[in-house]
């Protein structure tokens, strides 16, 4: 069914990290071009990428709008060089995407740990607040003011002379965690949100040590 | 509650027009598209029209283009379905639903019966 | 437009029945397929959309399979409530409704 030539488009898959968003489809196009569309339910589709060769298409600003909304996207695949032609329905040759809530399934991204300082036998881990692509009032949100005390970091932490990891919970970016004077320890920090029921977690963050460059040392 | 309240309906000479009214509550109105299908006596349903959240995208059956206009005022959360040049076979229970991208409806009003007799 | 096709229009069964309504699409339409049940005098009841997604609040024992052009609608074991008329509905293109199934007491 459909244009003679074109082929529907399929495997529409979301990509998303940390709200940046990328719809990826199959297959690479052969005398046909795409154009994407996107709505909320409210059916308002907005057409975007127009007349593309590529099998990707970057949605990052239609969803930030708002993300906790719901959206569909779909594919039409016109034949090269003449986009005005339709299918047997009267309309192009399209395929919808799964549903897509950015809130609740865009991957959160490695977090980074912005720095260390100790204090006697406490130490003070601070995660760096990824800014996202989400605006309000023209300026860039940062994941924590994204998803406020929905988001949690999880802290291990290990002495550098064992394998025993500890962990410790924060809703804010930081931490205040007890240590062994004079034990040099190592880092790596989680993104979670409980709440959810898919892509509860980021991967963990590069391992940072005392001794090393991002920590402070006070007596 | 989601509800929706179809009300306008009633007996109308063929030729004649009818405005049908569909009242929300229980949802944010202009977050979804809202369709109207109808029902003839004794037979299946047939999809009449539907309209985007923003009222900037409508679609009509063949059977009613040119005749019927859907229409929403999101301040009044309410749907309307503008019918004229009745005829016979527009003889339905007409109930509005809520639709969620335009394509299938997953809350529905109780019907209005329109009737276009002489 | 797509034409959509039900069968059995009318089906007799008994509580307990598994109970199987087809619906086939005069061309292909993915997953995108809603089933509806509507008792008489009263509107359609969505059961479920995207062919196998079970609306929610709806019972279990209803489930929804199929793509491209065939498309079932199970009822795993019959209740009383569940006789009534079940309608299916394609949204790929536009938007059109199978002639229906009535299921009745055997």
């Known amino acids: 069914s459909g244009t003679t030539n074109t082929v529907a488009a399929y495997n529409l898959t979301w990509k998303s990290t940390n709200f940046k968003t990328i719809l990826e489809w199959e297959p690479k196009p052969v005398n046909q071009v795409y154009t994407v569309q996107i709505s909320t339910k409210s059916g308002d589709w907005k057409s975007k990428c127009f007349y593309t060769t590529d099998t990707e298409c970057d949605l990052t600003d239609e969803i930030v709008k708002d993300v906790k909304q719901t959206y569909l996207a779909r594919v039409f695949s016109y034949p090269a060089g003449n986009v005005e032609s339709t299918g047997s329905a009267g309309e192009p040759l399209y395929e919808n995407s799964p549903e897509f809530t950015p809130y609740l399934e865009t991957n959160l991204g490695q977090p980074t740990i912005q720095s260390f300082e100790q204090v006697g036998t406490k130490v003070n881990v601070t995660v760096e607040d990824e800014r996202t692509l989400v605006r309000r009032n023209n300026t860039f949100l940062s994941l924590r003011d994204v998803f406020g005390k929905d988001l949690i970091y999880t802290l291990y932490y290990w002495k550098s002379s064992s394998s025993g990891k500890k962990t410790a919970k924060t809703h804010t970016n930081e931490f205040l965690i007890d240590v062994d004077k004079g034990e040099n320890y190592c880092f790596s920090v989680q993104a979670v949100i409980p709440s959810r029921k898919v892509n509860r977690k980021s991967t963990d963050s590069p391992v940072e040590c005392m001794g090393q460059e991002k920590g402070e040392f006070r007596e | 509650e989601v509800q929706l309240l179809e009300s306008g309906g009633g007996l109308v000479q063929p030729g004649g027009s009818l405005r049908l009214s569909c009242a929300a509550s229980?949802?944010?109105?202009?977050?979804?598209?809202m369709g109207w299908v109808r029902q003839a006596p004794g037979k299946g349903l047939e999809w009449v029209s539907t309209?985007?959240?923003?009222?900037?995208?409508?679609y009509y059956a063949d059977s009613v283009k040119g005749r019927f206009t859907i229409s929403r005022d999101n301040s009044k959360n309410t749907l309307y379905l503008q019918m004229n040049s009745l005829r016979a076979e527009d003889t339905a229970v007409y109930y509005c639903a809520k639709a969620p991208y335009g394509y299938y409806m997953d809350v529905w009003g109780k019907g209005t019966t329109v009737t276009v007799s002489s | 437009d797509i034409q959509m096709t039900q069968s059995p229009s009318t089906l007799s069964a008994s509580v307990g029945d598994r109970v199987t309504i087809t619906c086939r699409a005069s061309q292909s339409i993915s997953s995108w397929l809603a089933w509806y049940q509507q008792k008489p005098g009263k509107a359609p009841k969505l059961l479920i959309y995207?062919?196998?997604s079970l609306e929610s609040g709806v019972p279990s024992r209803f489930s929804g399979s199929g793509s491209g052009t065939e498309f079932t609608l199970t009822i795993s074991s019959l209740q009383p409530d569940d006789f009534a008329t079940y309608y299916c509905q394609q949204y790929k293109s536009y938007i059109t409704f199978g002639g229906g199934t009535k299921v009745e007491i055997k």
């Open positions: 229980g949802f944010t109105f202009s977050d979804y598209a």
């Open positions: 309209i985007s959240g923003s009222g900037g995208l409508t």
């Open positions: 995207k062919a196998s």
